[in-house]
């Protein structure tokens, strides 16, 4: 007897799909070996139709898939658009040849069943409305009309023209005639439920002269659409329930034995297990909506259903759409930190993975907000302006070819705590969710800038120093000038580097930056930070105000600007990757045009496509030492 197990008989009808699950013993070899589906020929040879090695036969092209689920020790063969020619004997198995471990499966595909000539077949989905058409002769024009449902030999009246309605059809069934038609009446049954299915007889008149019509009503529960997604990737449930429920509350629920537990609805309900990683988005005025879930976990696998009802909860007799989600643990998406911790006044550097094949895609970082259906406004992007409230403290550093980019947020406050998403305009599966937890600082920050009231005078020399502890001795120290399109690294001078690391003096580890001579455009935010190669670490920010030599009043009150950065921890920001914009003296003139485009573009990521990356900051006004 074979250790492989599956269904020995599968039957379906033409045009339909089947999904055949084969179970194998849970061993490392079995998990990784070739899986196959082959058709048994009369000569005993089993011809491969599809395998996990990527082989797909001509007759299965565009209509079949084989997916391995090593965590469940199963693989699934999906075959769509069945025809009677698919009827036959098959094997699902494991091994490098088709003679290894296998299980025999018999597939039978039948024609769509036909009903007797006098029976009209109505096929409707749960929650929809059926209109049953009942024809009669002129002689019964003024006779009683009725619709009954066959139950064994009896036929129980559902509704009749004397205004009787069976209690189980109350408010759901109506009998009517259209316009001047004198040979036909109709019965509408709305909010269909599975038990409405069966044979109905409509009748006009009594006795032998009565006119009768048979109607076979089939009420279908939605066949779940199969969705196969990788661990840590994202899934979108596209729900289209029709115009009749356009104004009702919408929901997505997950089936749990007898119930369907609401994950999210448009009335504000949300399952805590999906906090920070779910969005419900209305698509149009016709009731279409989508639900996006990111950061898929193994336990997210299961049956999902979307629906509509004024309560925002599943109700029998209301339209639904269904999916079965499989989560494959063999994921191409790397494991990254799901929780990042910071302290007030400090910074965080968040590494966002993206599909390495799409290094030119636009990268974004957004803040998930719980209000209503959840939303994620973009805070920064490769061609998106930094959102208001994040100026000087948030930047995105792209590292092309590395398969990751870094977002740095500094001057952290407790209000920065929450969920953030990394996303690109490319492969939508690569959306990752990070929870940022900001705690109150209990000690001084690792990086400190002096002077703290940084006011530079035009035409003079201005030096600013960043003190770092010995633990950062071996790391690369840098200064960068923040602008709306990044934080561009400046030439700087590391005074601690002259010393031997053995005798590291905590008080004299300094990296300094000099502006000589100071120009008006030097005004703005500067960051001091540490990094190792492409891995960014701690940063701190300071606002440098620039004033005229002749005037006493500074352009911006430096005390106010740096109070936010240094003295008021509750307003401080986190580590962020930044981009430089217009504060450059000797840049290539072509970049100025790009920067104007960036400034004029809207603040939504998809609207910010202007090109222009300021590159290295070697041309900073004045020289840095």
């Amino acid at each position: 007897q074979s250790p492989i197990f599956g269904p020995q008989d599968v039957s379906s009808i033409e045009g339909n799909s089947v999904s055949i699950t084969c179970y194998y013993p849970d061993t490392s070899v079995n998990r990784h070996t070739r899986k196959y589906w082959c058709r048994q020929g009369a000569n005993g040879y089993c011809a491969t139709l599809i395998s996990s090695n990527g082989y797909l036969s001509k007759e299965y092209s565009g209509r079949a898939s084989l997916i391995n689920f090593p965590e469940n020790s199963t693989f699934v063969i999906n075959i769509a658009h069945l025809t009677q020619e698919d009827t036959g004997s098959y094997k699902c198995g494991l091994g490098t040849t088709n003679r290894g471990l296998f299980f025999d499966v018999s597939l039978e595909v039948s024609q769509v069943p036909e009903f007797p000539n006098d029976t009209h077949v109505y096929t409707k989905d749960i929650g929809r409305t059926v209109t049953i058409e009942c024809r009669f002769k002129e002689g019964n024009a003024h006779s009683k009309k009725s619709l009954c449902k066959k139950r064994g030999e009896a036929c129980e009246v559902v509704i009749d023209s004397t205004e009787y309605v069976d209690p189980s059809y109350k408010d759901r069934a109506i009998l009517f005639m259209k316009g001047t038609s004198r040979d036909i009446f109709y019965v509408n049954i709305s909010h269909l439920i599975p038990s409405d299915a069966g044979l109905y007889v409509c009748q006009a008149g009594e006795g032998p002269s009565a006119d009768k019509n048979n109607a076979d009503l089939q009420v279908l529960e939605p066949e779940p659409e199969l969705l196969y997604k990788d661990l840590r990737s994202s899934v979108t449930f596209e729900c289209d329930l029709g115009r009749e429920v356009a104004n009702d509350a919408k929901y997505l629920c997950r089936k749990n034995k007898e119930t369907c537990d609401v994950i999210i609805n448009t009335l504000g309900k949300r399952d805590p297990a999906f906090e920070g990683r779910i969005l419900l988005t209305p698509r149009d005025d016709n009731g279409r909506f989508s639900v996006l879930i990111t950061g898929l976990r193994k336990e997210d696998a299961g049956h999902y259903q979307c629906g509509a009802h004024s309560s925002g909860l599943p109700q029998e007799g209301w339209p639904v759409q269904a999916w079965q989600l499989f989560v494959n643990e063999e994921s191409t998406i790397p494991n990254s930190r799901s929780v990042v911790k910071g302290v007030t006044g400090g910074s965080v550097a968040i590494v966002c993975p993206y599909n390495p094949k799409e290094s030119s895609s636009l990268k974004y970082w957004c803040h998930w907000e719980a209000d209503e259906n959840g939303r994620c406004p973009v805070l920064v992007g490769t061609q998106a302006l930094v959102q208001e409230g994040y100026e000087g403290r948030l930047a995105l550093f792209d590292q092309p070819g590395s398969g990751a980019y870094t977002v740095i947020l500094n001057q952290l406050t407790t209000q920065d705590s929450g969920f953030y998403w990394c996303l690109t305009d490319g492969d939508s599966r690569w959306r990752t969710t990070i929870e940022l937890q900001v705690a109150e600082a209990t000690k001084k920050p690792d990086l400190e800038v002096t002077p703290q009231n940084a006011t530079a005078v035009i035409g003079e020399t201005f030096t600013i120093s960043c003190h770092y502890p010995c633990k950062f001795y071996s790391q690369e120290k840098y200064w960068c000038k923040w602008s709306n399109d990044g934080c561009h690294i400046l030439p700087s001078h590391d005074e601690g580097a002259r010393q031997s690391s053995v005798s590291c003096d905590q008080s004299s580890q300094i990296v300094s930056m000099t502006l000589n001579p100071v120009k008006k455009e030097d005004e703005g935010w500067y960051w001091c930070g540490v990094k190792e190669g492409q891995v960014y670490g701690e940063t701190t920010a300071i606002y440098v105000a620039v004033e005229e030599r002749t005037r006493g009043s500074p352009h911006i009150n430096p005390t106010d600007a740096n109070a936010r950065a240094k003295d008021a921890p509750e307003e401080e920001a986190m580590e962020s990757s930044v981009r430089e914009d217009e504060n450059k003296a000797n840049l290539d003139p072509r970049l100025f045009a790009d920067e104007r485009e960036i400034q004029n573009a809207g603040d939504q990521a998809q609207e910010n496509r202007a090109s222009g990356n300021a590159g290295s900051a070697g041309g900073q006004s004045g020289s840095s030492k």
Epitope: N16, S17, S19, T74, P194
Partner: nanobody, 127 residues
Framework: EVQLVESGGGLVQTGESLRLSCAAS????????MAWFRQVPGKEREFVAA??????????YSADSVKGRFTISRTSPKGETYLQMNGLKPEDTAVYYC??????????????????WGQGTQVTVSS
């Protein structure tokens, strides 16, 4: 809530046949797996056979020990489920349970995946 009621058990001679029925009342499902398990006192429940209705497709499973002798069938997604047992042997003696799960999940042989169970019907095969 779904109730499952088994019937058709009894005492038969080796080689004879029995037909067990499982009637389901309550909700009707179209995405449904119905199964038969059996249990001998002091032993774990053993999978016998299962049938799945998913949309208009049906999937039939059976244990190696009963292949070719026992057949599971179901007239419609809302009808009764039957276990036709031919060529009965003394080792088939057990309490037979009907089980159901909707939506269809997990390995049909695993009793933990089922959320509805009947009370059981005794089948005794004497030699």
């Amino acid at each position: 809530e779904v109730q499952l009621v088994e019937s058709g058990g009894g005492l038969v001679q080796t080689g004879e046949s029995l037909r067990l029925s499982c009637a389901a009342s309550g909700r009707a499902f179209s995405d449904l797996r119905m199964a038969w398990f059996r249990q001998v006192p002091g032993k774990e429940r053993e999978f016998v056979a299962a049938v799945e209705w998913r949309g208009s497709s049906r999937y039939y499973y059976s244990a190696d020990s009963v292949k070719g002798r026992f057949t599971i069938s179901r007239t419609s997604p809302k009808g009764e489920t039957y276990l036709q047992m031919n060529g009965l042997k003394p080792e088939d003696t057990a309490v037979y349970y009907c089980a159901a799960v909707s939506p269809v999940v997990g390995d049909p042989r695993n009793s933990d995946t089922y959320n509805y169970w009947g009370q059981g019907t005794q089948v005794t095969v004497s030699s």
